[in-house]
């Protein structure tokens, strides 16, 4: 079951999922000045048994015949209106991320792929959060939320997560507005950008991945 | 179950010091940030001092800053607030809080009331 | 500091009615607002985060709106239970500040 709105948004930081669950959907989207060949795949979905899973269909991005000044926005899937967006990264693998069933690994990038990843998370689907760079955790260990099914409907769990400027001692944080601030993003972008820079995931974060260190949810 | 329970309030008069405790249980104490929060009586609420799970950092409300000073002993599983030069205006009830992502578990309160 | 202010202070309504409390920002929180509960000599429960997110064991009737510098908590059908104080609180920048409350009474 396709979960129904985005992670959780944490002011100064950002999410990133290291494996995909088996009914993940990517947008096969590309990058201006190209559009998918016309018999291509609206999306890539993530499928398999129980001792592989893998990403069905291949995006494919070819010219566009007739120079397009605006965004190329992709068609979605019916059944889902959100968009969940990650910028473009290169592929990163936790030690144990090949072994975990029912998951898929970081599709590699395709030719002329576009600059964010529009992906449709399935209910279980488990991302993790780190601060922007020049913020820092006031927790420890991984934070992540998890989409779960209750009651019928679909939920994000809160992840444990307050990041504050690492300039800032001895008094609240916020005082000078960094360029990190979600202020920079408009009111109706609901999706969360991943930045360039990779997450440093260490490996106990690996070895959590399905069972967290510490509580995400206390209520 | 989460549970906090504050210690240390009392009545004090202007210019004294009070140190108040929480004692913190059910849930990995070292692993998570805390904070201490104020409510005037039949006042709002605000925001007096944050610490990291590890105590290296530290915030604190310009209202309080240089007179207040939040700690914790993780050993112990215990935060402290050390309040010191109190002022009639921080006569209120000081409550421990967690969770500050996640809805944020709270304790009872302790009353300091700041009076000669 | 971002400076929080509620409205109404108060507001008198009856079991059944549906209520709507507003809080503004002095600049934009970009989402990031909690809504509490509090009852008399109770600690402040949250209601809401992320302006419309429901916290786990909220009633449904509890819902938010909102974005920029202007956000709404809507309760759909007043239920005796729900007669308290409630408190708008922005967590996009440091230091988190609450709004001054509504008390909400019934008529």
């Known amino acids: 079951e396709l979960c129904d709105d985005d992670p959780p948004e944490i002011p100064h930081a950002t999410f990133k999922a290291m494996a995909y669950k088996e009914g993940t959907m990517l947008n096969c989207e590309c990058k201006r000045g190209f559009r998918r060949i016309k018999s291509g795949s609206l999306y890539m979905l993530c499928t398999g048994n129980s001792s592989h899973s893998s990403w069905d269909n291949q995006c494919q991005c070819t010219s566009s015949a007739t120079r397009n000044t605006t965004k190329q926005v992709t068609p979605q899937p019916e059944e889902q209106k959100e968009r969940k967006t990650t910028e473009m990264q290169s592929p990163m693998q936790p030690v144990d991320q090949a072994s975990l069933p029912g998951h898929c690994r970081e599709p590699p990038p395709w030719e002329n792929e576009a600059t964010e990843r529009i992906y449709h998370f399935v209910v279980g689907q488990m991302v993790y959060y780190q601060c922007v760079q020049g913020y820092r955790a006031l927790h420890r260990g991984p934070a992540e939320s998890v989409c779960k099914m209750t009651h019928g409907k679909t939920r994000w769990t809160q992840p444990q997560l307050i990041c504050t400027g690492e300039m800032e001692t001895s008094q609240f944080p916020g005082e000078e507005k960094p360029q990190a601030s979600p202020e920079g993003r408009p009111e109706s972008e609901t999706s969360c950008l991943v930045t360039t820079t990779d997450f440093q995931i260490q490996t106990e974060m690996a070895a959590t991945m399905e069972t967290s260190i510490f509580t995400t949810e206390y209520q | 179950q989460v549970q906090l329970v504050e210690s240390g309030g009392g009545v004090v008069q202007p210019g004294r010091s009070l140190r108040l405790s929480c004692a913190a249980s059910g849930f990995t104490f070292s692993n998570h940030a805390m904070a201490w929060v104020r409510q005037a009586p039949g006042k709002g609420l605000e925001w007096v001092a944050v610490i990291s799970y590890d105590g290296s950092n530290k915030y604190y409300a310009d209202s309080v800053k240089g007179r207040f000073t939040i700690s914790r002993d993780n050993s112990q599983n215990t935060l402290y607030l050390q309040m010191n030069s109190l002022r009639a205006e921080d006569t209120a009830v000081y409550y421990c809080?967690?969770?500050?992502?996640?809805?944020?578990?709270w304790g009872q309160g302790t009353l300091v009331t700041v009076s000669s | 500091d971002i400076q929080m202010t509620q409205s109404p202070s108060s507001l008198s309504a009856s079991v059944g009615d549906r209520v709507t409390i507003t809080c503004r920002a002095s600049q934009s929180v970009s989402k990031f607002l909690n809504w509490y509960q509090q009852k008399p000599g109770k600690a402040p429960r949250r209601l809401i985060y992320?302006?419309?997110s429901l916290q786990s064991g909220v009633p449904s009737r509890f819902s938010g709106s909102g974005s920029g510098t202007d956000y709404t908590l809507t309760i759909s059908s007043l239920q005796p239970e729900d007669f308290a104080t409630y408190y708008c609180?922005?967590?996009?920048?440091?230091?988190?500040?609450f709004g001054q409350g509504t008390k909400l009474e019934i008529k």
């Open positions: 992320g302006t419309n």
């Open positions: 809080t967690t969770g500050l992502n996640s809805g944020y578990d």
């Open positions: 609180q922005q967590y996009n920048s440091w230091p988190w500040t």
